[in-house]
């Protein structure tokens, strides 16, 4: 069975009040993607199902937009949005793949001065 690779936007930072695109890309496999889940820590953000389309979790409906592609756009960011985000690809016949993104939401003045979050 061929094993693919998940590429993500990695560790990213954004300004409070702004928006950010979370992107994952599955490559190096011919597996069929049947569903992609977007999760934040222990919360479901959204599902993109190959047959049923997008479902945005009710608690995020006002601030989450589907796309581009299989990605997710987070809007009206707050410092509470800082944390880990996961894209979970359900595929046939490979099984599941998970990508991890760490988002740091910065106060406007900090973001304007070019600060960037880094994991040592």
């Amino acid at each position: 069975m061929m094993t693919g690779t998940i590429e993500t936007t990695g560790n990213i930072s954004a300004e409070k009040g702004g928006s950010i695109i979370l992107q994952c890309h599955l490559s190096s496999t011919t597996a069929q993607v049947t569903q992609v889940n977007w999760e934040q820590q222990d919360q479901l953000l959204a599902i993109c199902n190959a047959d049923l389309g997008w479902h945005i979790s009710p608690s995020f409906k006002d601030r989450v937009a589907p796309g581009p592609g299989l990605g997710l756009t987070l809007q009206s960011l707050t410092v509470n949005d800082t944390g880990e985000y996961f894209c979970i690809y359900h595929t046939y016949p490979d099984g599941t793949y998970t990508g991890r993104i760490f988002l740091e939401v910065l106060e406007s003045s900090v973001a304007e001065h070019g600060a960037r979050f880094q994991i040592p």
């Epitope: 999760e39 919360q43 479901l44 979970i88 490979d94 599941t96 793949y97 998970t98 994991i119």
Partner: nanobody, 121 residues
Framework: QVQLVESGGGLVQAGGSLSLSCAAS????????MGWYRQAPGEQRDLVAT???????TYGDSVKGRFSISRDSAKNTVYLQMNNLKPEDTAVYYC???????????????WGQGTQVTVSS
């Protein structure tokens, strides 16, 4: 080194029930999804059920309403309760998980050795 160890397979009559469990052990920093896939002779490995960290379950069409997946996060263990089993459920059942071994690593994809489930008519 991460290991997935399945238990609970066996022979059961049609209409009966069986429970499978899968325990992940080793170097585990985080688990995003655990689940079950099955493979009948001469066929591709197919989805049975998965359960994500956020609690979202996904089931294969042929098992919906009959099988139920659950977990014990503290024990890094996932369970599959199979009811109203049919002869066409006969297959090798594999545990599958996406596991991060350290804070700096990416999620690896792991499979168990498989456990045979045979449903007789």
């Amino acid at each position: 080194q991460v290991q997935l160890v399945e238990s609970g397979g066996g022979l059961v009559q049609a209409g009966g029930s069986l429970s499978l469990s899968c325990a992940a052990s080793g170097s585990i920093f985080g688990i995003s999804v655990m689940g079950w896939y099955r493979q009948a002779p001469g066929e591709q490995r197919d989805l049975v059920a998965t359960l994500t960290r956020a609690g979202l379950t996904t089931y294969g069409d042929s098992v919906k309403g009959r099988f139920s997946i659950s977990r014990d996060s503290a024990k890094n263990t996932v369970y599959l309760q199979m009811n109203n089993l049919k002869p066409e459920d006969t297959a090798v059942y594999y545990c599958h998980a996406n596991i991060m071994e350290s804070a700096a690593s990416t999620f690896g994809r792991y499979w168990g050795q498989g456990t045979q489930v045979t449903v007789s008519s």
